[in-house]
């Protein structure tokens, strides 16, 4: 008995070889004995039924005189899982069709976080072994239902899943969207009054995108966190629903999600959670964004530069004057040297000699008020 | 072809009312966001007022908030301006215009209407 | 609202010439702006959106550039029928707002 393996949806290709090489006349048939198609002499492909009840079964009229009669079930379906036999030259060929299905749970559109579970459907009496392959190569295996929890941002694009069976094999390819912000986390460095921008962009694309969001404020300086602003998402298109007064913050209306902040000031640094809950689906996408403001200061003969909001204990902030060697350079949030000579002095906030922030405040002789470019 | 033609101006009191109306064809009419904007006698561009595509949601410069309302009806492929308590300010040319796909610009204006506000 | 400021308000040129207009925005606004002419008596017709891209139909000469709060709109090779006032709109959010106005007058 010959197996052949099919995908549900797809065609499979059932064969019946003559020894002769040349055009014959062949019967397909169920295993019950009712006909399916055939060719009776006359090189004229005759249909065991009625058209609507036969329409997915088909051959090749162009291998008849190469001595080859397959059959061809088109748009399979799991039921067509059976034994065909083809008659031809006083002999009986039976052919085992094997229809299978994977499917993901639910939806192949999932939240970051969330598990995806891949299931194969097989007929009575297979035994397949099933392997996944992730879109970042990673393998998993196992018997008719495939587990991967906490899905990640690179787990999204083509899962190939090879089903195997009596050494033969067939392919599925499953597309899977985890639904996810680019990044898990960003940071703005920004000087005293200067204009922020946070950007939200979304790791996927999708023709219709509706649901509600919100950004939640944690200020340094705060007690507790606050709601600074509430939009709806409908097919791509935002709308701010509430915003506190202070900050006065702008949000575009388009993708990606994007929020002005008109000026970086002390009382507002530190860090955001942006939530975003999609329409029909469990669970939210997040993103923390974190803001850290710079400023440099001369108060009589103390000359200071601050940094407010998260910064991490390796940051080195530093005041030098232009040109020179740093005067002063500590892994602390605040730094400043008495009586600083006149001249451009730079506060600078570096990792490892990078520099994140820099703020210029000019020192003039001890008669005169210090100036900020 | 894709096509705005604006109707609806003339001649007003101070404290009147008049609704603008843009008859749109060969496009999606309900797919897409629309505008209204003006332009009184030799100044520049003022938008006026939007209504967004699918969702429907309205927007209007603070210059005629309270006075003006947009609307629009899909079956009859028609944007709407109303307005009312007009003041001679709001003397202008009134054109509709359609914007691209995901906002990509205003691509389709209308020929305008004229509005005159004046006792 | 979003200010945009467009400068200069007039411009003189030659045909032939290359012509720079920018408008700033009082805030940031990705590149969500677009650049509109007019010529007296007509509508006005789309020359660029998102900042940079080109509508259809728009000769190649016409090109604009920037994003965040300063915009610059380019003609490369001026044409007897560029002479007309340019716009910029600010399309990032509601309520949306024109710069004030460019006329390129020939010389």
């Known amino acids: 008995k010959t197996l052949v393996l099919g995908k549900e949806g797809e065609s499979a290709e059932l064969p019946c070889e003559s020894s002769q090489k040349k055009i014959t006349v062949f019967t397909w048939k169920f295993s019950d004995q009712r006909k399916i198609l055939g060719q009776h002499g006359k090189g004229v492909l005759i249909r065991g039924g009625s058209p609507s009840q036969f329409d997915r079964f088909d051959s090749k009229k162009g291998a008849w005189e190469k001595g080859s009669f397959p059959l061809i079930i088109n748009k399979l379906k799991m039921e067509d899982s059976q034994t065909y036999i083809c008659e031809l030259e006083n002999r009986k060929e039976e052919v085992e069709l094997w229809v299978f299905k994977v499917t993901a749970n639910s939806d192949t559109h999932l939240l970051q976080g969330q598990s995806l579970t891949l299931t194969l459907e097989s007929p009575p009496g297979s035994s397949p072994s099933v392997q996944c392959r992730s879109p970042r190569g990673k393998n998993i295996q196992g018997g008719k239902t495939l587990s991967v929890s906490q899905l990640e941002l690179q787990d999204s694009g083509t899962w190939t899943c090879t089903v195997l069976q009596n050494q033969k094999k067939v392919e599925f390819k499953i597309d899977i969207v985890v639904l996810a912000f680019q990044k898990a986390s960003s940071i703005v460095y920004k000087k005293e009054g200067e204009q922020v921008e946070f950007s939200f962009p979304l790791a996927f694309t999708v023709e219709k995108l509706t649901g509600s969001g919100e950004l939640w404020w944690q200020a340094e300086r705060a007690s507790s966190s606050k709601s600074w602003i509430t939009f709806d998402l409908k097919n791509k298109e935002v709308s701010v629903k509430r915003v506190t007064q202070d900050p006065k913050l702008q949000m575009g209306k388009k993708l990606p999600l994007h929020l002005t902040l008109p000026q970086a000031l002390p009382q507002y640094a530190g860090s955001g959670n942006l939530t975003l809950a999609l329409e029909a689906k469990t669970g939210k996408l997040h993103q923390e964004v974190n803001l850290v403001v710079m400023r440099a200061t001369q108060l009589q003969k103390n000359l200071t530069c601050e940094v407010w909001g998260p910064t991490s204990p390796k940051l080195m902030l530093s005041l030098k004057l232009e040109n020179k060697e740093a005067k002063v350079s500590k892994r602390e949030k605040a730094v400043w040297v008495l009586n600083p000579e006149a001249g451009m002095w730079q506060c600078l906030l570096s990792d490892s000699g990078q520099v994140l922030l820099e703020s210029n405040i000019k020192v003039l002789p001890t008669w005169s008020t210090p100036v900020q470019p | 072809e894709v096509q705005l033609l604006e109707s609806g101006g003339g001649l007003v009191q101070p404290g009147g009312s008049l609704r603008l109306s843009c008859a749109a064809s060969?496009?999606?009419?309900?797919?897409?966001?629309m505008s209204w904007v003006r332009q009184a006698p030799g100044k520049g561009l003022e938008w006026v007022s939007g209504i967004s595509g699918s969702v429907g949601s309205t927007y209007y410069a603070d210059s005629v908030k309270g006075r003006f309302t947009i609307s629009r009806d899909k079956s009859k492929n028609t944007l709407y301006l109303q307005m009312n308590s007009l003041r001679a300010e709001d003397t202008a040319v009134y054109y509709c215009?359609?914007?691209?796909?995901?906002?990509?610009?205003?691509?389709?204006w209308g020929k305008g209407t004229t509005v005159t506000v004046s006792s | 609202a979003i200010q945009m400021t467009q400068s200069p308000s007039s411009l003189s040129a030659f045909v032939g010439d290359r012509v720079t207009i920018t408008c700033r925005a009082s805030?940031?606004?990705?590149?969500?702006l677009g650049w509109y002419q007019q010529k007296p008596g007509k509508a006005p017709k789309l020359l660029i959106y998102?900042?940079?891209s080109l509508q259809s139909g728009v000769p190649s000469r016409f090109s604009g550039s920037g994003s965040g709060t300063d915009f610059t709109l380019t003609i490369s090779s001026l044409q007897p029928e560029d002479f007309a006032t340019y716009y910029c709109l600010q399309d990032y959010n509601y309520p949306y707002t024109f710069g004030q106005g460019t006329k390129l007058e020939i010389k």
């Open positions: 215009a359609k914007e691209g796909y995901d906002w990509s610009g205003m691509d389709v």
């Open positions: 998102a900042a940079s």
């Open positions: 805030q940031g606004i990705r590149n969500d």
């Open positions: 060969g496009f999606t009419f309900s797919s897409y966001a």
